[in-house]
Interface confidence: low
């Protein structure tokens, strides 16, 4: 693996904890991931919906599986996208 690939990996894994944070400073990152999830039909970064912690309840449409062509799973009684976003984000960064 290249050094840049490793840095991207580490950065994304490190930022996973921001999804479950409740401070104002993390909101911008969370909102960016929400937009990305809707676009690429994925959920969370590493562990799926669980990455969002208690915030999962606070964003009503988070990860909601409306396109059943994509793999979905049940999480806290809701149907959510099964695939995590990390690989999509890495592909997106590589292409841009």
């Amino acid at each position: 693996k290249s050094k840049s690939d490793r840095i991207v990996n580490e950065t994304l894994y490190e930022n996973t904890k921001l999804l479950s944070a409740t401070g104002e400073s993390e909101k911008q990152f969370q909102e960016a991931i929400i937009v990305f999830q809707e676009e690429f039909k994925c959920c969370g970064l590493v562990n799926g919906a669980a990455d969002w912690g208690n915030n999962f309840q606070h964003y009503p449409e988070l990860c909601a599986c409306l396109d059943k062509q994509r793999p979905c799973q049940s999480y806290n009684g809701k149907q959510v996208y099964k695939e995590t976003c990390i690989s999509f984000i890495k592909d997106f960064l590589a292409k841009n």
């Epitope: 009503p60 909601a64 409306l66 062509q69």
Partner: antibody, heavy 121, light 106 residues
């Protein structure tokens, strides 16, 4: 047996508001997603809105987005549709319907008998 | 939005004959398709879900088939109580209905 009984329909002027209710019985209401579907006189069925079992997710057809609000009161086993800025093209029979799944992403398995909404001056 | 197209709009059939109704999706909906029966003055009733699974209360003369974009509802031998309007609906991505097929007595 599953029963869905709509009420609140009637005649209203363009620009007016109306609130539809749907009383549910015969099943655990708080475990199911619920839809509103409408049917204009002599026309086909049009999906209007859906709400998750716990009220956390709500989705609307483009034709009603920003004007209609779906909500539910699980303690009262009741589904609601608040309809604002009504137009002539909203004239229809409005059906309350149950989704087969709690998160309201599957097929409709039970329907109410409907309540008629007429928008006319 | 996925557009559902049903054909024919009206089907004239004699009692005892076979009726074949078609439903086409503008993009794949896998097997996430339902059929509903609606009689005049009544609410629709779930007839078929998952493209081919018959709902409770409907006899074996009703059958559904297809997947992807092409679906068929077949009524093997029409009875008087089967004359109605039939709607297909996809629930693969949001929810959209076909315009309906009216099955009438010939």
């Amino acid at each position: 047996q599953v029963q869905l009984v709509e009420s609140g329909g009637g005649v209203v002027q363009p620009g007016g508001s109306l609130r539809l209710s749907c009383a549910a019985s015969g099943f655990i209401f708080s475990s199911y997603g619920m839809h509103w579907v409408r049917q204009a006189p002599g026309k086909g069925l049009e999906w209007v809105a859906v709400i998750w079992y716990d009220g956390s997710n709500k989705y609307y057809a483009d034709s009603v987005k920003g004007r209609f609000t779906i909500s539910r009161d699980n303690s009262k086993n009741t589904l609601y549709l608040q309809m604002n800025s009504l137009r002539a093209e909203d004239t229809a029979m409005y059906y309350c319907a149950r989704d087969h799944y709690g998160s309201g992403t599957y097929y409709i398995d039970y329907w109410g008998q409907g309540t008629l909404v007429t928008v006319s001056s | 939005e996925i557009v559902m197209t049903q054909s024919p709009a009206t089907l004239s059939v004699s009692p005892g004959e076979r009726a074949t109704l078609s439903c086409r999706a503008s993009q794949t909906v896998s097997s996430n398709l339902a059929w509903y029966q609606q009689k005049p003055g009544q609410a629709p009733r779930l007839l078929i879900y998952g493209a081919s699974t018959r709902a409770t209360g409907f006899p074996a003369r009703f059958s559904g088939s297809g997947s992807g974009t092409e679906f068929t509802l077949t009524i093997s031998s029409l009875q008087s109580e089967d004359f109605a309007v039939y709607y297909c609906q996809q629930y693969n991505n949001w929810w959209t209905f076909g315009q309906g097929t009216k099955v009438e007595i010939k």
